[in-house]
């Protein structure tokens, strides 16, 4: 079994978390994918999901969360912009195949957002100054609601989903983007877990 680990990221209000979820296997390219938060004592909550089937290089925006799936490189880009203190929590990226249980793709992220905007990069060596742009054509996708033995998906919490952004392009200047390479669960673990399942739509790491 794969041990669930988490990595801690400390950011300030107003900054952007920019994550690359690595799914690698082609059979997952078109699968719907989701960004979830796990609050203490609660089941995971889906904050945003791609379309079904997931479209290539087609941004989906839910409030301050933007998802963009890059099929040709097996990467799902997740951005949480204009972070708020209430966004603090434990997050994960999953392959979302209801009614089956979502499959986590990488180490969970423990996000800690603190008060006080910093216009300069923090202590994280991966910090960069960036302008995050969201195309005007950003789509909003509906995430299916379903319950499985260990996962419950429901409407996103107010702290994340109810903060709306204009449909026009977002320009975030003087924002620290924390970029991290997400690790996928082991190849054999994921493959064996999925091999007996029929893919509802339409793949792993070493």
């Amino acid at each position: 079994a794969t041990k669930l680990t988490e990595e801690k990221y400390e950011l300030k209000e107003g900054q952007t978390l920019d994550v690359k979820c690595d799914y690698t296997l082609e059979k997952f390219a078109s699968s719907q994918k989701a960004w979830q938060i796990i609050r203490d004592g609660e089941m995971p909550k889906t904050l945003a999901c791609t379309e079904r089937p997931s479209k290539n290089s087609h941004p989906v925006q839910v409030g301050r969360i933007i998802l963009e799936d890059y099929h040709d490189h097996g990467l799902l880009r997740v951005a949480m912009v204009n972070l708020q203190v209430e966004d603090s929590g434990l997050y994960q990226c999953v392959i979302y195949q209801p009614p089956k249980e979502p499959h986590m793709l990488f180490d969970r992220i423990r996000l800690v957002v603190t008060k006080g905007f910093s216009g300069t990069p923090g202590s994280n060596e991966n910090s960069t100054q960036n302008v995050y742009k969201i195309p005007p054509t950003t789509t909003k996708a509906l995430c299916p609601l379903y319950t499985s033995p260990r996962t419950v998906t429901q409407a996103p919490p107010k702290s994340t989903a109810d903060v709306s952004t204009p449909d026009s392009e977002i320009n975030l200047t003087n924002v620290t983007d924390i970029i991290r390479e997400q690790k996928l669960i082991s190849e054999e673990d994921l493959e064996q877990k999925l091999i007996s399942e029929e893919d509802l739509h339409h793949h792993h790491h070493h």
């Epitope: 082609e26 390219a29 490189h73 493959e191």
Partner: antibody, heavy 121, light 111 residues
Framework: EVQLVESGGGLVQPGGSLKLSCAAS????????MHWVRQASGKGLEWVGR??????????YYAASVKGRFTISRDDSKNTAYLQMNSLKTEDTAVYYC????????????WGQGTLVTVSS | DIVLTQSPDSLAVSLGERATINCRAS??????????LHWYQQKPGQPPKLLIY???NLESGVPDRFSGSGSGTDFTLTISSLQAEDVAVYYC?????????FGQGTKLEIK
């Protein structure tokens, strides 16, 4: 244990054809793209091409040096990838390796031992 | 096509000393902050063996004296303390764009 075994190599005259096979075992063959890489004696490695999975409609990609002459195919039911080589030239003489990546545009973690193709009159 | 140029073509290093091989790409091999650049070792009569993937990740079972670094267009493979069994030809390879390409190889020998 992942194993890749190439076969079908041999001596062929210029302009002739040859079909190489790569028998795979130890993993779910249909899940991964398969590649062919060649190496002329005393020379470096040259990527020949790849074939993706059913999820990607078995799309194929080739190096410019073989495009239009070589065709990569696969039979998932037989766990086998193929390299059909037509209009062979002397410069195609090389050891041909079958290799498996670790996912979309990922590294080649598994290689076969190779099969020698000699194009000569 | 992306051209990978390795330097030097050949290298002689004393046992226990550091060996450094460079690989320069004609254009970036990065997508976002992922570098789709890998390193292989090949010994005579054998197929290549994966050492480093995505620029800096050590393949399972590979000794930790091997390390990789770089991003964009410039990459480095380092062997911190050369061992006799490290004598081989080393190749970099990019998979960011089709066609995939290899560097011309660097032959590493013992001085």
């Amino acid at each position: 244990e992942v194993q890749l075994v190439e076969s079908g190599g041999g001596l062929v005259q210029p302009g002739g054809s040859l079909k190489l096979s790569c028998a795979a075992s130890g993993f779910t063959f249909s899940t991964y793209a398969m590649h062919w890489v060649r190496q002329a004696s005393g020379k470096g490695l040259e990527w020949v091409g790849r074939i993706r999975t059913k999820s990607s409609n078995y799309a194929t990609y080739y190096a410019a040096s073989v495009k239009g002459r070589f065709t990569i195919s696969r039979d998932d039911s037989k766990n086998t990838a193929y390299l059909q080589m037509n209009s062979l030239k002397t410069e195609d003489t090389a050891v041909y390796y079958c290799t498996r990546d670790m996912g979309i545009r990922r590294q080649f973690a598994y290689w076969g031992q190779g099969t020698l193709v000699t194009v000569s009159s | 096509d992306i051209v990978l140029t390795q330097s030097p073509d050949s290298l002689a290093v004393s046992l226990g000393e550091r060996a450094t091989i460079n690989c320069r790409a004609s254009e970036s091999v990065d997508t976002f902050d992922y570098s789709f650049l890998h390193w292989y070792q090949q010994k005579p009569g054998q197929p290549p063996k994966l050492l480093i993937y995505r620029a800096s990740n050590l393949e399972s079972g590979v000794p930790d004296r091997f390390s990789g670094s770089g991003s964009g267009t410039d990459f480095t493979l380092t062997i911190s303390s050369l061992q006799a069994e490290d004598v081989a030809v080393y190749y970099c390879q990019q998979s960011n764009e089709d066609p995939y390409t290899f560097g011309q190889g660097t032959k590493l020998e013992i001085k």
